[in-house]
């Protein structure tokens, strides 16, 4: 399986909610013996390897807002400690998940990955990660709403395997 | 202050391949925003052919994107479209633009246009 | 795609008189939407970006309102050099798309 970023790019201004997404495409195994673990973090810019660094989403770490379930089911966080930072990761049947962040500030600004890990149980794991990056613009004429932009054609599902 | 400025062939032959040129002053095109192109056939409406990005990430409108390749000469500061596989209705005025000081604000700075006929 | 429609497709008016263009869009492009008028010849000029944000230096008898899918463009007191064609472009979902413009005149 692979994981897709349907937009690269999300400018919101302050103040906006914004959700992330990512996509897992490819065929999924629906086994008795596998576990998704699908869970969002921080990264930095200009790595050898992008999102090989893990930093925390408003003093969340990836562990605090992982998903895990198996195949294509449905999923959401534990809500109290990620809606009292005004965070909520979600997935749904169609292997899209995402993750939610309320009230942005500049300091939401950065880049963000998705990683899925396909556990199996007394068998190897399968890791694949996807980048986007958020800016929040601030100003007094700054657009009301958040714009996306796509990611590439030439990969436009900006596939990246870890 | 921002300008861009179209260049290219104001003729091509049917089938040949369109090449157009937009050389952009004032701002580094790898500093930030989406470098787009936009084509108008006379007498009719605006089409947008695609972008783009600051950090080399391109988009295509997909009624095109099987003919449409944009690239970019950072050294020069410039972007390129090619066109392939032209025919009369690839007739129009193309322009190179970007959006305003901020993202998602329209495309507030357009070159000039350059007027490309496709005829033999 | 989203299909951007305008109307009217021409309209004829007075100076001084208060003019409304609309546009609506086939599904919800939020405010995430723009109006640029051109003059026979010319380049398009940005007017109006995120449905209701006078660009720099644009006049004030230009301002849009809307959001989701119904917008419009109002010019409340028509003046000669006001003679384009205006059309909307949502920049909500890609491809980006525009109108199909409404040619404006002096009667």
């Known amino acids: 399986f692979k994981v897709a970023t349907p937009y690269s790019l999300y400018v919101c201004p302050e103040g906006q909610n914004v959700t992330l997404t990512c996509r897992l495409l490819g065929p999924v195994d629906k086994g008795h013996d596998v576990t998704f673990y699908k869970t969002w973090y921080r990264s930095s810019r200009g790595e050898v390897q992008t999102c090989s660094e893990r930093r925390p989403i408003r003093n969340l770490t990836f562990q605090d807002l992982h998903l895990h379930h198996g195949g294509h089911q449905a999923a959401n966080t534990s809500h109290d400690l990620a809606q009292r930072h005004g965070l909520e990761s979600a997935s749904d049947h169609h292997g899209n998940f995402s993750i939610t962040m309320r009230n942005l500030t500049l300091l939401d600004s950065g880049l963000y990955c998705c990683l899925v890990v396909e556990i199996r149980h007394h068998h190897s794991e399968h890791r694949v990660h996807g980048a986007m990056e958020l800016q929040v613009q601030t100003g007094k004429d700054a657009p009301s709403n958040c714009v996306v932009y796509p990611s590439s054609s030439q990969d436009s599902e900006n596939i990246t395997a870890a | 202050q921002v300008q861009l400025q179209e260049s290219g062939p104001g003729l091509v032959k049917p089938s040949e391949t369109l090449s157009l040129t937009c050389a952009v002053s004032g701002y580094s095109i790898t500093s930030g925003y989406f470098w787009n192109w936009i084509r108008q056939p006379p007498g009719k409406g605006l089409e947008w052919i695609g972008y783009m990005g600051y950090d080399g990430r391109i988009f295509y409108s997909p009624s095109l994107k099987n003919r449409v390749t944009i690239s970019v000469d950072t050294s020069k500061n410039q972007f390129s479209l090619k066109l392939s596989s032209v025919t009369a209705a690839d007739t129009a005025v193309y322009y190179c633009a970007r959006e305003g000081d901020y993202y998602g604000s329209g495309f507030a700075y357009w070159g000039q246009g350059t007027l490309v006929t496709v005829s033999s | 795609d989203i299909q951007m429609t305008q109307s009217p497709s021409s309209l004829s008016a007075s100076v001084g008189d208060r003019v409304t263009i609309t546009c609506k869009a086939s599904q919800n492009v939020n405010t995430n939407l723009a109006w640029y008028q051109q003059k026979p010849g010319k380049v398009p000029k940005l007017l109006i970006y995120s449905a209701s944000y006078r660009y720099s230096g644009v006049p004030s008898r230009f301002s849009g309102s809307g959001s989701g899918t119904d917008f419009t463009l109002t010019i409340s007191s028509l003046q000669p050099e006001d003679v384009a064609t205006y059309y909307c472009?949502?920049?909500?979902?890609?491809?980006?798309?525009f109108g199909q413009g409404t040619k404006l005149e002096i009667k």
């Open positions: 472009q949502q920049y909500n979902n890609y491809p980006l798309t």
